[in-house]
Interface confidence: low
């Protein structure tokens, strides 16, 4: 190509010619070039009109080009140049007109260019200059030359890493002539030992940075006194970890700041063990913004009401413990990436609106309500990248919240109540990667204004997406990626008429169905990449909403066979929606593996008779299989009854219960029956089932056949568990087949009638039979245990060794 | 691949090779040399970066006797008011810095430790350099 050996980054605009051993400016690049990087080439000398071939140039990088001389008019043709970078050039001769013609220059970087003085630097005519970086040079005097009065747009002057030792009143005289200047000045890493008092009197700066300027505490105090009279919007003091630091530092260090007018203060890197860091800041009670970055705060009394700060920032600091914060006027608190103080303790910040507590490894033992933060004004709360956060309140008093971020923290008790019920103003919610297991359909109740919901990297009960979004009518963005989802409710998205972006990628869907998306009138992006989609759920796939513009089906397991021909054809019909079609490849059959789905032509013809016979055969086999499957366990039970006959019962009872009632079974049932008199022996799946044998076989052979009775622990959890109901149905068959058998019902908690009616048989049985009801009172317990023992004693021969157990959670635990 | 020797200590020998095509020169001195049983000292680096060091971070890939540990990301420069003065270094500017280090010893088993250090900086992010350090550890050597 014509531009080689340079690299074309943006055609006709940006070219990178770095380190190509050029001795002269290349002449094979387009006239239209706007960005040109010629760094690390041995150009050595720039003559007049060096860049006449590039009249459109806006950014020119000449770093480390060994340039020693720059002649008059070297850049003469570059009237559009806005950025000129000369870093690392050992300039010895700089003509007075070196920078002439640069009528639009806004940024000049002359770092490490052997510059000894600003006085002789020929930039007085650069009226458009906004940023001048002359750091890492040999400048000894801070005297700002008279030509600075021409630089009325100057915003940044970087004089760091020079040789400035003293600042005198006369040095800044020119700034008095420029009262409207909004200048940020960096003087870090200059070996300062004297600032003449009054030098900064009545000077206004936007920002002043002084880091690693002083070699002793006394020098620091004297120099800060010398800043008296300065009005600065933002003052940054501190040190650097890799530079020589002061030997000592105490609370008197910043006393001189009382004579400055400061709007925002930041202390950056300080590694001293101070008795009480708060005493340092007596002169900073009235700044509006206060920041500590990389400061060691082992002991701190508290940040208390005397401070009038509106914004407090504590970043990358080391704390002995979480600080006590009680600041009446504070509106913004940023407390991020800190170490130590792992347990959040309450703060009292009545005016707080913005709170960022991210990346601290904090544990939070009762989130979240107004009392935690001492405010009802909070609009923004970021608790991301922390430790365990236990939800124990649904944001009472925090109804103003609009932004809430928990990502990559470990949320607990999320499915126990409607955590977000109060947050009707919330617009943004991120609970991605929070170990949340959605087992409660009301999880998002209350979020009527929510527009963005990110919940990637969590999981759902039975890997099924239920109707949890019914109240989120304003949702525009929903991320459900990496949630191990396998199925979704057909009506899961029915209320999301405003949804524009839906990310379902990185799940375990095996088929695609358009039906759930029929109500998404605003949907523009649907991402189903990185699933296992082979085919469609239904024979006939409908169209996606007409608003859809991007459909991502890349990296799925497409089955490119005749039986899926209609699905593959449907995919081709969606071609205009599909993104990255080249990454949509066949996974099966093996001879087509890796082939692009859209370029495939499958010809599929078959004899109609063969199809008819096949379909009929499949139907017959299916019906038989279904019947066998449906009654398989009942048949197995019957076979067992015949085989075992009236064999010896090892257990007094086999207990069926929901794993969610395990505490009660272990702590109450087990304790009282196993350790009582007489002791009863109960069949427990985890103790008495034989490892390696199928669960169903264990239930029937170990549970039913070897037990005299069955105890059924009925509760809300029990009714809602398919596995418990399955066991209960087997128990009924067992009772029917075995004349001696008996089922003892224990109702653990009042079960809603409507729930119970869903299980008609159980409802009838409980209506007709006497059952035991657990009542947690002294008298109630006494009666309960007496009746239960009586029921179990029926037909029991005395056996002094007793153990107690359970039956249903084996399956439930793995399936939920 | 040319091996660059860094130093020897009572229990370790440290060297590095480049793991990128660029192989821009970098000078690394450790004084006194790191002892894995625990030591403190000064790390001196001389380097002329090919990009600004703003937002510099390291990706560390550590191998212990052929066993790979998970990738570790170490952020060195956040982008404003950073801890290290070299974070403000620009492309082509000499970085000549001394960083003090100290660490309490961990009991390392004898063997060969490899650490690939990928330095990434700038916006947009690009690789600055890549070095593969090899540490031969002989716990009982003098």
């Amino acid at each position: 190509e014509s531009w080689e050996p340079c690299v074309e980054v943006v055609p006709n605009i940006t070219y990178q010619c770095m380190e190509l051993n050029f001795y002269k400016i290349p002449d094979n690049l387009p006239f239209s070039t706007k960005n040109l990087d010629l760094s690390f080439n041995p150009l050595r000398h720039l003559g007049s009109y060096s860049f006449f071939s590039f009249p459109e140039l806006q950014v020119l990088d000449l770093s480390r080009c060994e340039i020693q001389t720059i002649e008059d008019g070297a850049y003469q043709s570059l009237s559009h140049l806005s950025t000129l970078i000369l870093t690392g050039n050992p300039i010895q001769s700089l003509a007075l007109g070196a920078f002439s013609g640069l009528s639009s220059l806004q940024k000049l970087v002359a770092v490490e260019t052997n510059l000894a003085s600003l006085e002789n630097f020929p930039i007085g005519h650069l009226k458009t200059l906004k940023e001048l970086n002359v750091a890492h040079n040999l400048i000894q005097s801070f005297k700002l030359p008279e030509y600075f009065s021409n630089l009325t747009n100057l915003e940044h002057l970087d004089l760091s890493s020079n040789k400035i030792q003293s600042i005198y009143c006369t040095d800044l005289r020119v700034l008095h002539q420029m009262p409207l200047l909004n200048l940020s000045l960096d003087l870090s890493l200059n070996p300062m030992n004297f600032i003449q008092p009054g030098a900064f009197k009545e000077i206004r700066l936007h920002k002043l940075t002084l880091r690693n300027n002083f070699d002793s505490l006394n020098v620091m105090k004297t120099c800060i006194q010398g800043l008296a009279g300065l009005e600065v919007h933002r003052l940054v003091l501190g040190e650097f970890r890799n530079e020589g630091n002061l030997e000592k530092f105490d609370k008197s260090a910043l006393e001189g700041l009382c004579n400055l007018t400061i709007e925002e203060f930041r202390l950056a890197y300080l590694d001293y063990y101070l008795d009480d860091i708060i005493d340092l800041f007596n002169c900073l009670t009235n700044v509006s913004s206060f920041s500590l970055v990389s400061v060691t705060i082992e002991r701190v009394k508290d940040f208390s009401y005397n401070f009038g700060w509106q914004h407090l920032e504590l970043v990358n600091c080391k704390f002995g413990q979480f600080p006590t914060l009680k600041l009446k006027s504070l509106k913004r608190l940023t407390f991020t990436s800190n170490k130590g103080g792992n347990a959040f303790s309450e703060v009292d910040l009545p005016s707080l609106e913005f709170l960022d507590l991210s990346r601290n490894g904090l544990s939070f033992k009762g989130c979240c309500s107004q009392s935690d933060f001492g405010t009802t004004s909070l609009k923004y709360l970021d608790l991301s990248f922390n430790g365990v956060i236990t939800m124990s309140s649904n944001f009472l008093g925090l109804e103003q919240l609009e932004h809430l971020d928990f990502q990559h923290s470990n949320l607990k008790q999320m499915s126990e109540f409607s955590v977000f019920l109060s947050l009707r103003n919330l617009i943004y919610l991120d609970i991605s990667h929070t170990h949340t297991r959605v087992a409660f359909n009301g999880i998002f109740n209350g979020l009527s204004s929510l527009e963005v919901l990110k919940m990637a990297g969590n999981s759902f009960q039975e890997n099924f997406l239920p109707d949890i979004f019914t109240e989120l009518r304003n949702l525009t963005f929903l991320d459900l990626s990496q949630c191990q989802l396998e199925q979704l409710s057909p009506t899961a998205f029915n209320s999301l008429s405003s949804l524009q972006v839906l990310n379902m990628s990185h799940n375990n869907f095996f088929s695609l169905d358009t039906f759930p998306y029929k109500c998404l009138n605003s949907l523009q992006v649907l991402d189903y990449s990185l699933n296992h989609i082979m085919t469609s759920k239904k024979q006939e796939l409908q169209h996606f909403p007409s608003s859809l513009a991007f459909l991502n089906l890349t990296q799925n397991d497409f089955a490119c066979t005749c039986e899926h021909q209609s699905f593959l054809q449907w995919i081709k019909d969606q071609r205009q929606l599909l993104v990255e079609v080249e990454r949509m490849e066949c996974a099966t059959p093996s001879d087509k593996q890796g082939m692009p789905v859209l370029s495939l032509n499958i010809t599929c013809q078959m004899n109609k008779t063969i199809i008819g016979v096949s379909v009929l055969s499949v139907l017959v086999v299916s019906v038989v299989a279904v019947l066998v499957y449906k009654f398989y366990f009942h048949l197995m039970l019957l076979a067992g009854c015949i085989k075992y006959g009236r064999g010896e019962n090892i257990y007094d009872a086999f207990v069926i219960y929901s794993s969610q009632d395990e505490d009660w079974v272990r702590n109450e049932l087990v304790k009282n029956l196993e350790e009582g008199v007489p002791p009863f022996q109960l069949c427990l799946h985890y103790r008495d089932f034989i490892p390696g044998v199928a669960i169903a076989a264990n239930i029937i052979h170990e549970g039913f056949h070897k037990s005299r009775k069955v105890i059924v622990v009925v509760s809300q959890h029990f009714i809602q568990s398919r596995w418990c109901i399955f066991e209960y149905e087997i128990a009924q068959t067992w009772q029917f087949l075995s004349s001696r058998a008996g089922i003892i019902f224990i109702v653990l908690q009042k079960v809603e009638k409507t729930l119970l009616r869903q299980q008609v048989e159980l409802y009838r049985l409980l209506s007709r039979n006497t059952y035991l009801e657990w009542e947690d009172s002294v008298l109630g317990r006494h009666i309960f245990w007496r009746r239960l023992r009586k029921a179990l004693l029926d037909g029991k021969s005395w056996n002094p060794e007793g153990t107690v157990g359970t039956g249903c959670n084996w399956q439930e635990a793995t399936s939920i | 691949q040319k091996q660059y020797w860094v130093c020897n200590s009572s229990d370790a020998s440290i060297s590095y090779t480049y793991c990128d095509k660029m192989q821009y020169p970098i000078s690394i001195n450790v004084n006194p040399c790191i002892e894995l049983k625990g030591s403190k000292g000064l790390l001196h680096i001389f380097y002329i970066p090919r990009r600004d060091l703003k937002q510099l971070y390291f990706n560390l890939y550590i191998t212990v006797n052929t066993m790979n540990l998970p990738k570790r990301k170490e952020v060195i420069c956040r982008g404003s008011d950073d801890d290290y003065s070299f974070c403000r270094a620009l492309k082509g500017e000499t970085v000549n810095t001394t960083i003090s280090f100290s660490f309490k010893g961990i009991k390392f088993s004898k063997g060969k430790y490899k650490c690939v250090v990928e330095a990434i900086s700038g916006s947009p992010e690009e690789m600055l350099f890549c070095l593969e350090f090899v540490i031969l550890h002989q716990p009982n050597s003098n």
Epitope: D302, T324, A343, E346, G374, G387, T390 | -
Partner: antibody
């Protein structure tokens, strides 16, 4: 119901060490802080420190740093206080108490106390 | 550390009388807890976070205060209220108790 059961009284010699236990029932110690408090005759209550069993984290009043060590074993739902280099000043009743977020980490349940007597 | 000073250190009250125990802090705290300890028993939580009554505590007890001054009031003293009362702050490390007020019933 919530209970904290402390180990029995201890008579120890000066210079020795003692380890007191506090076994919780009715709640999981991982969900709370466990505090230890000292009560000497004719003195008020003195806070020794707390442990956060979930994060294996303990914090001490500087006066007890080096003297007391608080640990917890979540498997047995038990917290421990170990006191070293005992002197007559350490003769006191030591209480464990639960700090629970439902009452803003106030100590809502207390053990019955363990009397430690240091005497030669 | 924050020093909590309780006054009076000993107080004598008649049955049915209203009394107030005070607790002053050497510097501002966010809130105060109060405990009651009867002779030979463990302390018992009375008031948490300045004014919230702990469960099972009679309504004759109430708390108030802010900043450096907090108080516990018993509206109508009963014989069973004879005990030591301690204030306790948990908002600034290290967490401290007051020296206690001993309430005697005449």
């Amino acid at each position: 119901q919530v209970q904290l059961q402390q180990s029995g009284a201890d008579l120890v010699r000066p210079g020795a060490l003692v380890k007191l236990s506090c076994t919780a029932s009715g709640f999981n110690i991982k969900d709370s802080y466990i505090h230890w408090v000292k009560k000497r005759p004719e003195w008020g209550l003195e806070w020794i420190g707390w442990t956060d069993p979930e994060n294996v984290n303990s914090i001490y009043d500087p006066r007890f740093q080096g003297k007391a060590s608080i640990t917890a074993d979540t498997s047995s739902n038990t917290a421990f206080l170990q006191l070293t280099s005992l002197t007559s000043e350490d003769t006191a009743v030591y209480y464990c108490a639960r700090g629970y977020n439902g009452v803003y980490y106030a100590m809502d349940y207390w053990g019955q106390g363990t009397t430690v007597t240091v005497s030669s | 550390q924050i020093v909590l000073t309780q006054s009076p250190s000993i107080m004598s009250a008649s049955l049915g009388e209203e009394i107030t125990l005070t607790c002053s802090a050497s510097s501002s705290v966010i809130y105060m807890h109060w405990y009651q300890q009867k002779s030979g028993t463990s302390p018992k939580l009375l008031i948490y976070r300045t004014y919230n009554l702990a469960s099972g505590v009679p309504s004759r007890f109430s708390g108030s205060g802010s900043g450096t001054f907090y108080s516990l009031t018993i509206s109508s003293v009963e014989a069973e209220d004879a005990a030591d009362y301690y204030c306790h702050q948990w908002s600034s490390f290290p967490y401290t108790f007051g020296g206690g007020t001993k309430l005697e019933i005449k």
